[in-house]
Interface confidence: medium
């Protein structure tokens, strides 16, 4: 068990031409926050696939408002580290996705609006307990500088956080046969007493230098399945007459995989591909049941009705798959109404509403004209999620506050002359034309 820690140092325009001045518009203040997603191994998976090692969301950073004309300052960042706890062993190789989000804090109806500014991804090797690693990543015109590390939570230590150390209350309190953990001098650990190379999966030891094998395994290092061990005499009879294997067998000779499993050799040993309903190193364990805890992410396990289905996982909201292992793309259900933009932030679902709509799912159609006065005798017209004013003659603009020049648009056709009048405009038509706009 341990914690992956991410420290964001800076986020801003990268070098080179075309870089944006600021993530915030000059009109609206905004603030930044970050999301990190971790996956074991060197996966090339999409960002939407589950963050199997964990994910974290930063706090919101300080509010920033761009000052037009002023030099672009360093963007204020959220305080503190992003921390992703991991319960199992640290995998050593991992993939990360870091997203930079912008929260606009203007006077939008329906609250703040979120948008994804940049997403960077990478694959790294990292030992737990090591120093901070620094990194720079670019996404489009943006540049992100950050550091990261993995550290173990006591009593776990080691590069994978799998060695267990016992805290000691005073110097020299390590028990017999125990020595201080390096480099943590205030903890004790049992020395590795098994014979060098003894398989940790199939062997164990109680005395220094020994390697005792679990059932089904043999050899000095417990790496040879019992069913593939060769005859005692290297020149012994063939397996056809005695059932004894000829010397120097491959690890798959005699097929150590039970229950119809197929065997394939690996550099160290062998690997069984088990048929449905069997698992274990040699497919020796049958029928995964609820006792095996097959349902992830809080899924409820119920025994299946037929032998082919030994269990059924009832998944909590947000997860799917036979073992509740897949996160549902909640935005695919189109929960935001009235054209709202859906954002799945991992811990919560957010809808960014179009103007004129509000509510958690943009379900409320606001009265576009509420509190919107049209000046100078104009009348408010609602529609399309926004309001507009139908202005009295002689006035124009969004709120009818501007005195209009009725002749500015050259309304008189065919060379007619336009005259402004208190009630509107009058066209004096050229010879041969007539009508209010000289259109005939």
């Amino acid at each position: 068990a341990g914690v992956f820690e991410l420290q964001i140092h800076s986020f801003g325009p990268g070098p080179g031409p075309g870089a944006p001045r600021s993530p915030c518009s000059a009109r609206l203040p905004c603030r930044l926050f970050f999301r990190v997603c971790l996956k074991p191994g060197l996966s090339e998976e999409a960002a939407e696939s589950p963050c199997a090692l964990g994910a974290a969301l930063s706090a919101r950073g300080p509010v920033y408002t761009e000052q037009p004309g002023a030099p672009a300052p360093d963007l204020p960042l959220p305080d503190g580290l992003l921390q992703v706890p991991f319960r199992d062993a640290w995998p050593g190789t991992f993939s990360f996705i870091i997203e930079t989000w912008r929260e606009e804090l203007g006077d939008q109806i329906g609250g703040p609006a979120w948008s994804l500014l940049a997403r960077v991804a990478g694959r790294r090797r990292l030992a737990a307990g090591g120093p901070w690693a620094r990194d720079i990543q670019r996404a489009g015109a943006w540049e992100l500088r950050f550091s990261y590390r993995a550290r173990c939570e006591p009593p776990a230590v080691g590069t994978a956080c799998t060695r267990l150390c016992r805290p000691r209350s005073a110097p020299s309190r390590c028990g017999p046969g125990l020595r201080p953990c390096a480099p943590l001098e205030d903890e004790c650990e049992a020395p590795l007493v098994c014979r060098a190379g003894c398989s940790p999966e199939h062997g164990f030891c109680e005395q220094p230098g020994e390697c005792r094998c679990l059932e089904g395994w043999t050899g000095p290092l417990c790496t040879v399945p019992v069913s593939t061990s060769s005859c005692l005499s290297p020149r012994g009879p063939s397996s056809a007459t005695t059932g004894c294997l000829v010397p120097g067998p491959g690890p798959c000779d005699g097929n150590p995989c039970a229950n119809g499993g197929s065997c394939s050799e690996t550099p160290r040993s062998f690997e069984c591909t088990c048929p449905r309903g069997f698992y274990g190193l040699r497919c020796e364990v049958s029928g995964v049941t609820c006792a095996d805890g097959p349902c992830f992410n809080g899924g409820l396990c119920v025994g299946g009705a037929d032998p082919d289905s030994a269990y059924i996982c009832h998944c909590p909201p947000g997860f799917q798959g036979s073992n509740c292992e897949k996160r549902v793309d909640r935005c695919s259900l189109q929960p935001c109404r009235n054209g709202g933009l859906c954002l799945d932030l991992g811990h919560a679902l957010r809808c960014r509403c179009r103007a004129g709509f509000a509510g958690p799912r943009c379900e409320h159609d606001l009265d576009d004209c509420a509190g919107r006065a049209c000046a100078n005798g104009g009348t408010c017209v609602e529609g399309g999620g926004a309001h507009r004013c139908s202005c009295a003659l002689g006035f124009g603009g969004r709120d009818c506050r501007e005195r209009a020049d009725p002749c500015a648009a050259r309304p008189c056709a065919h060379g007619g002359r336009c005259y402004a009048h208190f009630s509107g405009l009058v066209c004096a038509c050229a010879p041969g034309y007539m009508g209010a706009r000289c259109e005939f």
Epitope: P155, C194, F204, C205, E284, V285, G293
Partner: nanobody, 118 residues
């Protein structure tokens, strides 16, 4: 500090049953390989059974078909159900734990005595 506490031992007649429990504290139980060993007077300590983190078990030939080892992650406890007990099963039974990336069982309980009379 990792602590293993065994219980359930006792005196039983041949053919009878006992259920040993081993409760772990101080570490995430799901991440531990659990095992039961036994040691009869004057004999070497012997692996009885082991249950991996995935839940699959292995057994010594002498107890196969009679003993069942299971784990209850919710209660951080491993159970050894012993049926059809024989006098030769008489021994001190020890619960042990380790991670699956290391060889040695680093964590041990104090042991519980099982005596089978004929």
């Amino acid at each position: 500090q990792v602590k293993l506490v065994e219980s359930g031992g006792g005196l039983v007649q041949a053919g009878g049953s006992l259920r040993l429990s081993c409760t772990v504290s101080g570490f995430t139980f799901d991440d531990l390989v659990m095992a039961w060993f036994r040691q009869a007077p004057g004999k070497e300590r012997q692996l009885v059974s082991l249950v991996a983190t995935a839940g699959n078990s292995v057994y010594a030939d002498s107890v196969k078909g009679r003993f069942t080892l299971s784990r209850d992650n919710a209660h951080s406890t491993a159970y050894l159900q012993m049926n059809g007990l024989k006098p030769e099963d008489t021994a001190m039974y020890y619960c042990a734990a380790r991670t699956d990336s290391e060889h040695a069982f680093k964590f041990w309980g104090q042991g519980t005595q099982v005596t089978v009379s004929s």
